[in-house]
Structures are given as C-alpha cells and as structure tokens.
Amino acid sequence: SAGAGSHCQKTSLRVNFEDIGWDSWIIAPKEYEAYECKGGCFFPLADDVTPTKHAIVQTLVHLKFPTKVGKACCVPTKLSPISVLYKDDMGVPTLKYHYEGMSVAECGCR
Amino acid sequence: SAGAGSHCQKTSLRVNFEDIGWDSWIIAPKEYEAYECKGGCFFPLADDVTPTKHAIVQTLVHLKFPTKVGKACCVPTKLSPISVLYKDDMGVPTLKYHYEGMSVAECGCR
C-alpha cells in the first residue's frame, strides 16, 4: 500500500454508503470502489503524475525552502462515474447510470 | 497566513527564478507571484473550495476512519499564465505572453 514514503499513486478505497450516511438515499450498491490518491510528490516529479508547471515550481521551491513551502499534493486529476440506484423525491427507485465524479480514474501532483 | 489549522485558501508565494535554477533560460521577470494553496479541507467542505463528489466522500470517510483515510487536499484548481522573456534557440530574447499554468487563480479541495 502507498504510504507517506511512497510516490503518488492510486490506491484502493472501498466506501460503504452506510458508513457515510448516504444509505438513506442510495439503495444500491451498498459499497463501491472510490479509490484514493496516496503518496508523496517528490522531486523530480515523474511524467506519470502529470505535474502542472505550478506543481513543478512549487516542488523546486520546497526543495530550496522546505520549511517555508509545502510539497505539491497527490490528488485525483481525473474522476469516473458510478451507477447508483437511488430514491427520487417521490421515493421512486431510479437508476442513475452516470453519477459523476465518484471514483478516481487518475492521480497526479498538484 | 494560512497554516494547517486554517481553511483551504490562496496565499502569497513569491518565486525567484534564480532560486529554482530557471534564470538560465527565463531572462525576466526575475521573480513572480505564483501563490500557494494552503490550509485544511475540513468537514463540512464549503462551496468556495468547490469540492468534487469524491472529495466530499473522502472527507466523510476520513471523519469516520481518520487513521485509515486522509483528508482531501487543498490544491490549485485553476491556474493563470504569466508573461516571460526567454532566449530562443538562436539566443534571441523573445516574449511569451502566455506561459500557461504558472500562477494559482483558485484553490479547492480535491
């Protein structure tokens, strides 16, 4: 698993809707793979973390002034939808094929 | 200034090109305002940090399992260009009006 010492990468994060209180309106699935972006954005930033110019600059400044400026952060840079069965306002079970932005597709340094 | 205890916000970060070794090709300006995104992504995530659904989910999971899952991260969500004077292959000073992605326009929780 990706700890603080490892490079920015996508790791598993199973989310149970009951744990976050969303089971009141999401009927199914009971849980889903959300993924999580974990790990550090270390110098030099690799191409696979698709760094912006600002992230590159911040990384270089952090290298020179580590106490003054933080590293870039490993975050989702592309998200995917999931399909959910939910209750609408009338309590009717309705399928939303593309509930956007729920699962990490790619991680990067920002 | 925005510390770890404050909410995610844009703070000043003056970057000197000499400090990061870019003065070899960027002639001017000598320094610029890059800004930095600092502060925490605390529950509940406010609208001004424009959270994605995944960031909201991760924040809720962190609330329940703080040691297992990290908080969302405060990062640049919109970047602005700067203008730079650089030397081309022939050594001719050339102005690039829009050197993209160099300065933070907006921060958010991701």
């Epitope: - | 002639i27 001017a28 300006p29 000598k30 320094e31 610029y32 700067i82 203008s83 730079v84 004077l85 081309d88 022939m90 001719v92 000073p93 050339t94 102005l95």
Partner: antibody, heavy 119, light 111 residues
Framework: EVKLEESRGGLVQPGGSMKLSCVAS????????MNWVRQSPEKGLEWVAH??????????HYAESVRGRFTISRDDSKSSVFLQMNNLRAEDTGIYYC??????????WGQGTLVTVSA | DIVLTQSPASLAVSLGQRATISCRAS??????????MNWFQQKPGQPPKLLIY???NQGSGVPARFSGSGSGTDFSLNIHPMEEDDTAMYFC?????????FGGGTKLEIK
C-alpha cells in the same frame, strides 16, 4: 553566420515608387518577425514597419508616417522580406535597414541601403 | 507614441573612466515585471548592434564593461572602463508598444 542583404536603393523622384527586398540566411527565417528601420540625420533611427509570422496570419504594422503608402510583405520559401514604397516624399530619404527579430527586439540587422527622394 | 529622451547628446570620456548615458521614457516601459528597454551601439558605416536588452542583460558577445540598469521610465547605460573601441553612437529603444521607438542617440568620444 546570420546575414541580411538589402537590395540596392537609389534615387527616386518625389511621388515615385521603389521596392526594396532583403534576403536572409543563417537562421530559420519563418520563425522571426521581419522589420524595416530607417535612419536619417533629421529623424535618427525610425522603425518603419514589421510583418509577423504565418501563425499570426502575417500581421503587419506600420509607422504613422508611412501608413497607406508603404507595404511590407514576406516570402518564407525564399527567406525574403520586401518593402513596397509608393508616393515617396523627401522626408522618406534615409538608410533603410532590414532587421529580423522577435516580438521583443531587433536582433539581426542588414548593412542598410540608401534611398534618396529628390527632384 | 512613447518618446525616449537621451542625455547627454554627446559625451567625451577618458580611457579607463566611466561613461554613463541616460534614457528617459515619456511613460513606463515596464510590463509583466519586464522592462521593454534595449540599448544599441552604432559605429560609422555600420548597422546598430544590440548591446543590452531588457534593461540590464548583455547581448551575445558584448563585453562585461557594458552594463545597463533602470526600470519604469528611467534607464542608464554604463561603460567602464572606457576603451578606444567604444567610440560610437548609442541609442536606447523601447519595444513595449508599437511603434517601437528609439532615443535620439548619444555620441561617445574619447577625451
């Protein structure tokens, strides 16, 4: 070695026309703005016109004193820039330099060619 | 148009001494943290040659005795130590706005 070579100028009567040309070598011509700058004892150094790149749709700009009378053009395939001068006046007399450069500076200069407008 | 006023119009300096030429713009030639000010040297019968760009950066092959400074509206060119080869006309030039304009020039001679 960078070289800019202007065509021979000469004497022309007021109201007359002349076309100057300039051939470049030693650099990638199509990557640079091309300009004409003139010099006279009365007016000193004076930018006349420039033509930008293909990516800028070969946009042109002129000094107010020559607008409507002079036309700058370029042929990237021949690494050449031209200045068509019409309705010439006595105050257009001077040494005409072909210069190449960026959107920031006149980097390369020709040796210049003398244009004399006189009856 | 941005008007550039150079002073003095002519200057005689002893060999080994410092020559200072000033250029004042009718409005600021700075933008984006960049000074759009250049200096050219011209010797008789030759085209101008780029000496200094962006106020303080030396052109290619320019000796270290040539230096530039300033920002906004006030700029200067320094030559130290003065050498015989430095006898020439010197022009400031701005590229912030079209039309790009030149100063009237300063004639530098040896005293």
């Amino acid at each position: 070695e960078v070289k800019l070579e202007e065509s021979r100028g000469g004497l022309v009567q007021p109201g007359g026309s002349m076309k100057l040309s300039c051939v470049a070598s030693g650099f990638t011509f199509s990557n640079y703005w091309m300009n004409w700058v003139r010099q006279s004892p009365e007016k000193g150094l004076e930018w006349v016109a420039h033509i930008r790149l293909k990516s800028d749709n070969y946009a042109t700009h002129y000094a107010e004193s020559v607008r409507g009378r002079f036309t700058i053009s370029r042929d990237d395939s021949k690494s050449s820039v031209f200045l068509q001068m019409n309705n010439l006046r006595a105050e257009d007399t001077g040494i005409y330099y072909c210069t190449g450069g960026s959107n920031y500076v006149f980097a390369f200069w020709g040796q210049g060619t003398l244009v004399t407008v006189s009856a | 148009d941005i008007v550039l006023t150079q002073s003095p119009a002519s200057l005689a300096v002893s060999l080994g001494q410092r020559a200072t030429i000033s250029c004042r713009a009718s409005e600021s030639v700075d933008n984006y943290g960049i000074s759009f000010m250049n200096w050219f040297q011209q010797k008789p019968g030759q085209p101008p040659k780029l000496l200094i760009y962006a106020a303080s950066n030396q052109g290619s092959g320019v000796p270290a005795r040539f230096s530039g400074s300033g920002s906004g509206t006030d700029f200067s060119l320094n030559i130290h130590p003065m050498e015989e080869d430095d006898t020439a006309m010197y022009f400031c030039q701005q590229s912030k706005e079209v039309p790009w304009t030149f100063g009237g020039g300063t004639k530098l001679e040896i005293k």
